[in-house]
């Protein structure tokens, strides 16, 4: 087992978290992907898209919307008006089903704070981008937390871009308990995709 | 360890067909797009074009300068990208370089030695 | 198409000096946060070498006296201290859209 690298975002309360969730592989281009948050030892996925995953085609529910770029292997996370209670650890992963989900990246640590009311934003610090590299060896990491550059005095409807530049992508099995994941390699995940793909035909067939 | 290997270069009149081949090893060939490139002597870089996966029906794109005179196509059981060249013209002459990208748009994190293609009478 | 210019075209630098070495887009090649440009050096004979990818990110292997800047249209590639094994052809790239296209390449040299 390995741990992963967490990071940690702190934001207040009425801020868009954006997530750039990079798979970068064509064959994961129409697989479902969502968005989940870990809840004790399972995942809760908040948000997903269709299966297949449509292309450029948005995916809201509630305040998440989800919008796919096939074309750039980018699936894009967006979560407005953040509140204190969506505090956590998330994840962008390709979904299978609960017990079963790729995640994509090292998880988000999300911490959402009060803000101090009728502060005025300065238009510099309004939008920003965080850029989160994976890691592209499978190593054990500590957990490490680093925090955005600060947003002082940011505006309610300040947006916090998140992105995930990669040479290669790591992809994990999220098995029972979030620091406790198994690296698996492109290929190994792509043969496990085919295969249960294969049942899933078979199974209707 | 990934490794590239292009043949089938050598002499050709102008007007001549010639194809490129590149054996890939080291990788899920299937899974990445496959991309030729080339360079004339003493000039540039020039990308020729590239193929995608089965997930997306194999598109193939084009630099201008050889679109529908070049054809790249790939097998994935032999682990094999090729390029069929016609219609030759002496502005062809170049090393051709086979080039595996690092995922959808991205990188070239890996290339062939090369195959030189002569165009001459 | 998009463009991509080199400047300069030929470059001269001391040794253990600052090599600079900038690509304009003649559009945007970022999509949302990411640049789709990257840096390659080549030396005589041998295939290019990736060195940065989408505009800052280091290549594993490749020494962090490489850094890579810029979004949107233009670009740097920075070698921080020039070594002898530095001499080379360097390439920008951006894969943003298609076709790809590479600029014309700068030619470093030790002065």
């Known amino acids: 087992t390995t741990e992963l690298t967490e990071e940690k975002y702190e934001y207040k309360e009425g801020q868009t978290l954006e997530v750039k969730c990079d798979y970068t592989l064509e064959k994961f281009a129409s697989s479902q992907k969502a968005w989940q948050k870990m809840e004790g030892k399972m995942p809760k996925i908040l948000a997903k898209t269709e299966r297949p995953s449509k292309n450029s085609h948005p995916v809201q529910v509630g305040r998440i919307t989800l919008e796919d770029y096939h074309d750039h292997g980018l699936l894009q996370v967006q979560m407005t008006n953040l509140q204190v209670e969506d505090s956590g650890l998330y994840q962008c992963v390709i979904y299978q089903h609960p017990k079963e989900s790729h995640v994509l990246f090292n998880p988000i640590c999300l911490v959402v704070t009060k803000g101090s009311s009728g502060t005025p934003g300065s238009s510099e610090n309004s939008t920003q981008n965080v850029y989160r590299t994976p890691s592209t060896t499978a190593k054990a990491l500590g957990p490490r937390y680093t925090s955005p550059r600060t947003v002082t005095q940011a505006p309610p409807e300040s947006t916090v871009v998140v992105s995930t530049p990669g040479s290669e992508i790591n992809l994990t099995n999220v098995t029972d308990i979030i620091r406790e994941q198994k690296l698996i390699s492109e290929e190994d995940l792509e043969q496990k995709l085919i295969s249960e793909e294969d049942l899933h035909h078979h199974h209707h067939h | 360890e990934v490794q590239l290997v292009e043949s089938g270069g050598g002499l050709v009149q102008p007007g001549g067909s010639l194809k490129l081949s590149c054996a890939a090893s080291?990788?899920?060939?299937?899974?990445?797009?496959m991309h030729w490139v080339r360079q004339a002597s003493g000039k540039g870089l020039e990308w020729v074009g590239r193929i995608r996966t089965k997930s997306s029906n194999y598109a193939t794109y084009y630099a201008a300068s050889v679109k529908g005179r070049f054809t790249i196509s790939r097998d994935d059981s032999k682990n094999t990208a090729y390029l069929q060249m016609n219609s030759l013209k002496t502005e062809d002459t170049a090393v051709y370089y086979c080039?595996?990208?690092?995922?959808?748009?991205?990188?070239?994190?890996?290339w062939g030695q090369g195959t030189l293609v002569t165009v001459s009478s | 198409d998009i463009v991509l210019t080199q400047s300069p075209d030929s470059l001269a630098v001391s040794l253990g000096e600052r090599a600079t070495i900038n690509c304009r887009a003649s559009?945007?090649?970022?999509?949302?946060?990411?640049?789709?440009l990257h840096w390659y050096q080549q030396k005589p004979g041998q295939p290019p070498k990736l060195l940065i990818y989408?505009?800052?990110n280091l290549e594993s292997g490749v020494p962090d006296r490489f850094s890579g800047s810029g979004s949107g249209t233009d670009f740097t590639l920075t070698i921080s201290s020039l070594q002898a094994e530095d001499v080379a052809v360097y390439y920008c790239q951006q894969s943003n859209e298609d076709p790809y296209t590479f600029g014309q390449g700068t030619k470093l040299e030790i002065k």
């Open positions: 989408r505009a800052s």
């Open positions: 559009e945007s090649v970022d999509t949302f946060d990411y640049s789709f």
């Open positions: 080039t595996r990208d690092m995922g959808i748009r991205r990188q070239f994190a890996y």
């Open positions: 080291g990788f899920t060939f299937s899974t990445y797009a």
